[in-house]
């Protein structure tokens, strides 16, 4: 999913059906003055960045696992 500039939300689209084994780390951004929505940005093991749907139960599980493993910020 394309990442926009920091002056607004970064996630224009979210990626569906990503596997936990492909994810290196996850960054979760809370709403702020630049963006009204929660954003989940995954760094994949191949170096690419991908936006995930924060409302998806699968993504919530990924965040929980990453938090346990210390791979989320």
């Amino acid at each position: 999913a394309p990442l926009a500039t920091e002056l607004r939300c970064q996630c224009l689209q979210t990626l569906q059906g990503i596997h936990l084994k492909n994810i290196q780390s996850v960054k979760v951004k809370s709403p702020g003055p630049h963006c009204a929505q929660t954003e989940v940005i995954a760094t994949l093991k191949n170096g690419q960045k991908a936006c995930l749907n924060p409302a998806s139960p699968m993504v919530k599980k990924i965040i929980e696992k990453m938090l346990k493993n210390g791979k989320s910020n």
């Epitope: 002056l7 607004r8 939300c9 996630c11 224009l12 809370s30 709403p31 003055p33 630049h34 963006c35 009204a36 929505q37 929660t38 924060p54 409302a55």
Partner: antibody
Framework: EVQLQQSGPELEKPGASVKISCKAS????????MNWVRQSNGKSLEWIGN????????SYNQKFQDKATLTVDKSSSTAYMQLKNLTSEDSAVYFC???????????WGQGTLVTVSA | QAVVTQESALTTSPGETVTLTCRSS?????????ANWVQEKPDHLFTGLIG???NRAPGVPARFSGSLIGDKAALTITGAQTEDEAIYFC????????FGGGTKLTVLQ
């Protein structure tokens, strides 16, 4: 279609508290922060604060830190704002407002008139 | 607390271009102030127009655009229409959103 439906008008006595609601529909409630804004004397707007339902985190305008309490009920997709120790200066129309990808204040509720009078 | 100042009223005609501005008491408005523009029509009907200085909200006509002009944030309506008659508020971010007093825009036929 995004909709924010606010509760009806309130008439309260000085010193009382009031809790107003904003029921959201047409989107995934937890993903977007909910702002609260007030309009006094039919003109100026003041930002009260914001509630992030995803992490249950609030941000307040310092002016309203001791006046307003923002909460949500995720199960009913409803945001609430409680105002305490009301004075005549709190008489205003209060709005909830949700953002979009582009802007913080994209979608607004219809407003709730709060009148504080002895 | 910073003060945000707008023109109190402006008048334009259909088809004309009009620019509303938003000044900060703390100095030049920058992209870090994340300027937002909101339209108010009668009966408390609010609609967000612009966020992050120049990002148009969903469904907002292309004639509305946001920018920085000199030391101010600006909302330009290119080819104003009678339905654009409204009050326009800007909001700037400091450590909270601070709204200006609003500009009443009249579109005279």
């Amino acid at each position: 279609e995004v909709q924010l439906q606010q509760s009806g008008p309130e008439l309260e006595k000085p010193g009382a508290s009031v809790k107003i609601s904003c029921k959201a529909s047409g989107y995934s409630f937890t993903v977007y922060g909910m702002n609260w804004v007030r309009q006094s004397n039919g003109k100026s707007l003041e930002w009260i604060g914001n509630f992030d339902p995803y992490f249950s985190v609030t941000s307040y305008n310092q002016k309203f830190q001791d006046k307003a309490t923002l909460t949500v009920d995720k199960s009913s997709s409803t945001a609430y704002m409680q105002l305490k120790n009301l004075t005549s200066e709190d008489s205003a129309v209060y709005f909830c407002a949700r953002g979009s990808w582009e802007t913080i204040f994209a979608y607004w509720g219809q407003g709730t008139l709060v009148t504080v009078s002895a | 607390q910073a003060v945000v100042t707008q023109e109190s009223a402006l008048t334009t005609s259909p088809g004309e271009t009009v620019t509303l501005t938003c000044r900060s008491s703390t100095g030049a408005v920058t992209t870090s102030n994340y300027a937002n523009w909101v339209q108010e029509k009668p009966d408390h009907l609010f609609t967000g127009l612009i966020g992050g200085t120049n990002n148009r909200a969903p469904g907002v006509p292309a004639r509305f655009s946001g920018s920085l002009i000199g030391d101010k944030a600006a909302l330009t309506i290119t080819g104003a229409q009678t339905e654009d008659e409204a009050i326009y508020f800007c909001a700037l971010w400091y450590s909270n959103h601070v709204f200006g007093g609003g500009t009443k825009l009249t579109v005279l036929q």
